[in-house]
Amino acid sequence: TPEVWVQVQMEATELSSFTVHCGFLGPGSISLVTVSWGGPDGAGGTKLAVLHPELGTRQWAPARQARWETQSSISLALEDSGASSPFANTTFCCKFASFPEGSWESCGSLPPSSDPGLSAPPTPVPILRAD
């Protein structure tokens, strides 16, 4: 069964910077990746970035840079402009669409006791959809 993993990392040098890493474990080619925060895409979450292997990427604040790391993984850099760190308590979700197989989504967040520079362990919580 395909699986999606999500890691949320706080940068050691800039405590206001976070990076979300997501990857797809499974067969098939990825046709679209959507990163959202506050919940799954389409279920109360807000799209932060959309990455398409051919059409390119779109991102919205507070996302700073979305990019492909491999053919099946992406990273999204976030800039926290506020004095506090709302990202620390936020859920980030990544949805990988593999056409025509369907889409798989998983969510993760920064562990409360995370040290800067350390990433959260992969926490796949698959949300299977038959899109």
């Epitope: 046709s31 679209l32 506050g38 979450g45 807000t46 959309v50 398409h52 889409s103």
Partner: nanobody, 127 residues
Framework: HVQLVESGGGLVQPGGSLRLSCVAS??????????MAWFRQAPGKGLEAVAG???????TYADSVKGRFTASRDNAGFSLYLQMNSLRAEDTAVYYC???????????????????WGQGTMVTVSS
């Protein structure tokens, strides 16, 4: 809950211009649809696809409006616009905004998979 609200309709003379707007709003989150599109329904006629634009900026137009109408979206991704130039009497219709998501981020064949619809705004082209 997602709501689409259109504005900008009105009465215009043949050859004139109008700009329609549509804003997608949701309770509790910002909704950025993969695809946003315009449809229209002329008096006594069926629903007709006019234009669609995906989240990457790719556009699709009905043959009847190509070269006259231009669809665009704002940078935030949740507003849709339709610039209508060289309007004709046959453009008279109620114009509806529609939005939805698709497996690959593009607009599906217009009319398919768009699960949110606005209430419509009336455009009348008459001298």
């Amino acid at each position: 809950h997602v709501q689409l609200v259109e504005s900008g309709g009105g009465l215009v003379q043949p050859g004139g211009s109008l700009r329609l707007s549509c804003v997608a709003s949701a309770s509790g989150f910002t909704y950025r649809p993969y695809c946003m599109a315009w449809f229209r329904q002329a008096p006594g006629k069926g629903l007709e696809a006019v234009a669609g634009i995906d989240i990457f900026g790719g556009t699709t137009y009905a043959d009847s409006v190509k070269g006259r109408f231009t669809a665009s979206r704002d940078n935030a991704g949740f507003s849709l616009y339709l610039q209508m130039n060289s309007l004709r009497a046959e453009d008279t219709a109620v114009y509806y905004c529609a939005a939805g998501d698709s497996p690959d981020g593009r607009c599906p064949p217009l009319g398919q998979g768009l699960n949110y619809w606005g209430q419509g705004t009336m455009v009348t082209v008459s001298s």
